[in-house]
């Protein structure tokens, strides 16, 4: 398969309260059942209607959950991760990694497990434009003196 997928990766702390419909989401992944190749992380696979996650609105399907109430989810068996959530109590703090797809192009291919960053030109172009605007403003300011 040709084509390149690039991602803007952001992290967020999401605090949820287990409501009458629970936290209301499902997970996949773990060291014994990898969801992404070369990545044993825990991912959100489904968000249920009327659950705390759906009502809050920030957690998205495909998000990677890094920690629960400060406890790291790295290198956990799937069932151990499930148990961690189920025993997390009423108030649950999630550290979450969102991956926003920012570009598709026919340049090579990155593996699913590579949380590759934003393309360099997408950083350089705005920086260059900002520099040019600042230089132009500076020159006009000098001319007025």
């Amino acid at each position: 398969m040709n084509g390149r997928v690039d991602y803007l990766v952001t992290e967020e702390e999401i605090n949820l309260t287990r409501g009458p419909s629970g936290l209301g989401f499902n997970i996949v992944g773990g060291t014994d059942q990898q969801y992404v190749s070369n990545d044993s992380g825990i991912y959100v696979s489904r968000i249920k209607e009327n659950g705390a996650a759906a009502l809050d609105g920030r957690l998205q399907e495909g998000d990677k959950i890094l920690s629960v109430n400060g406890q790291d989810l790295k290198n956990l068996l799937h069932q151990d991760a499930v148990d961690l959530f189920r025993n997390a109590g009423y108030a649950v703090s999630l550290r979450v990694q969102h991956r926003l797809q920012v570009q598709n192009g026919p340049i090579g291919h990155r593996g699913e497990g590579d949380p590759s960053g934003i393309p360099i030109f997408m950083v350089l172009v705005p920086v260059f434009a900002l520099t040019m605007v600042a230089a132009w403003a500076f020159m006009r300011y000098r001319q007025q003196l």
């Epitope: 014994d32 249920k48 659950g51 799937h78 959530f85």
Partner: nanobody
């Protein structure tokens, strides 16, 4: 195409035993667990027992604890429900189900919507 086929249902006297089987065909590599649900006339389908596909973790609803045993044979892609000490209130159509993820909520929140594949059901009648 994933298919779940149940067998082993039937008519049994109170106190008797039955063993239900559920044979899965098709790709099951991404399954996280399998379960048995039951539904009696006029009632909602309810989760009876669940077994994780890899870890051997099991769940039983309170009313069947100590009487029913869920087990799986990964090599045969088959899940079993051994039902002992059957009671008239166990009468229902029993459905096999498979899930491709796990709910993060306790079992009392888990229901039909957490399972992705279903069998056609097998009737269990306890007289």
């Amino acid at each position: 195409e994933v298919q779940l086929v149940e067998s082993g249902g039937g008519l049994v006297q109170a106190g008797g035993s039955l063993r239900l089987s559920c044979a899965a065909s098709g790709p099951s590599m991404n399954w996280y667990g399998m379960a048995w649900f039951r539904q009696s006339p006029g009632k909602e389908r309810e989760l009876v027992a669940d077994v994780s596909w890899s870890g051997g973790s099991t769940y039983y609803r309170d009313s069947v604890k100590g009487r029913f045993t869920i087990s799986r044979d990964n090599a045969k892609n088959t899940v079993y429900l051994q039902m002992n000490g059957l009671k008239p209130e166990d009468t229902a159509v029993y459905y096999c189900a498979a899930r491709t993820s796990s709910s993060v909520d306790p079992w009392n929140y888990v229901g039909v919507g957490d399972y992705d594949y279903w069998g056609q059901g097998t009737q269990v009648t306890v007289s």
